[in-house]
Amino acid sequence: FVRTKIDTTENLLNTEVHSSPAQRWSMQVPPEVSAEAGDAAVLPCTFTHPHRHYDGPLTAIWRAGEPYAGPQVFRCAAARGSELCQTALSLHGRFRLLGNPRRNDLSLRVERLALADDRRYFCRVEFAGDVHDRYESRHGVRLHVTAAPRIVNISVLPSPAHAFRALCTAEGEPPPALAWSGPALGNSLAAVRSPREGHGHLVTAELPALTHDGRYTCTAANSLGRSEASVYLFRFHGASGAST
């Protein structure tokens, strides 16, 4: 299930005045598409161009991150007169052209979504042959990937003065809220660190001082679900053990 965000500002500004018989270069992409991790998403992209009945060689390209300079994630080429766009690049084999570039449609399907796919994507078409021309969406479509929480790391670490602290790192979108529970803790939100730069979906919570032996449980929760993991502290054994 894919939701396309309607940009109210765009709609407000989008009052058609006259229709124009001759097209010019333009690209239409929604501001945002949302889908869940593990699912597939469709990134719509249609275009108009000034070259009537163009039938020459063309290349369709999608890039990620930034316009013009971002890395390509998909590229295909269609020979003169052909409606088949032969895939030349599909990053990790997860990108597939849904649209027909000959019919001004570059829509792309992204399979097996991961949180790392949460980026802005830019479509581009290039004409070669009799006509040499190209156009790229400047604003792009933001792929918003949502995911239930997953605890990626839970550990007990030594602290100064023979003490111990516990760390719990989870990922999810929306970023999950983390809570620790354990001996003499009740439920504690315990020093949640903000998502780190470049790791926007990761959240870390620290228990700075473990005062009692026993089981400490980290719970990560967001609107899509929850996840738990535990560590065990046995100081009388002179060591700590972890179980997830």
Epitope: H18, R24, G65, E66, G70
Partner: antibody, heavy 116, light 108 residues
Amino acid sequence: QLQLQESGPGLVKPSETLSLTCAVSGASISNWWSWVRQPPGKGLEWIGEVHHSGVTTYKPSLKSRVTISVDNSKNQLSLKLTSVTAADTAVYYCAREFADDAFDIWGRGTMVTVSS
Amino acid sequence: SSELTQDPAVSVALGQTVRITCRGDSLRKYYASWYQQKPRQAPQLVIYHKNNRASGIPDRFSGSISGNTASLTITGAQAEDEAAYFCNSRDTSGNYLVFGGGTKVTVL
């Protein structure tokens, strides 16, 4: 609501560097942003643009003298124009590109005079 | 010289129709946008892309494009429409933006 505010020295000496900033408030800086100038009594001249990712494009005749950058943490963009002459005297505007090549939000502009 | 050419000035009687033109080879490939600028004010977007009105712009303003010419038409001009009007688009290479020289509209 989105507002843009240009700021910088109103007077710059010839051969020096003109430095302006544009503060973006009321919205994310995730977009394309342009600097446009207007000499007194004349038309608009596009200087260049920057995407929030740092990609830039400059007017070819100014390219050797101009640098446009964006500071996402401060929600501002900046313009640097080196080796200025009297011909660079103008009102300088920053503007947001909301659709391909169309600017829907403009700052009020700041007047910069190049004179010794 | 600008890659987009506009007539320096036009006048129109109150309530009448005026058409402002913008010419340039790049307009065969790219859409034009139009801006209104009143004295001591920043420009304001009027028409963009495939002849779409910007937010808050009255429907007496309309746009069209044909060949290498983009046009802005004010049907039933009002006193408050007296201003300079600028067009902008891409250059012929598509690599950067250009503005027309502007047209001063006087409402008589």
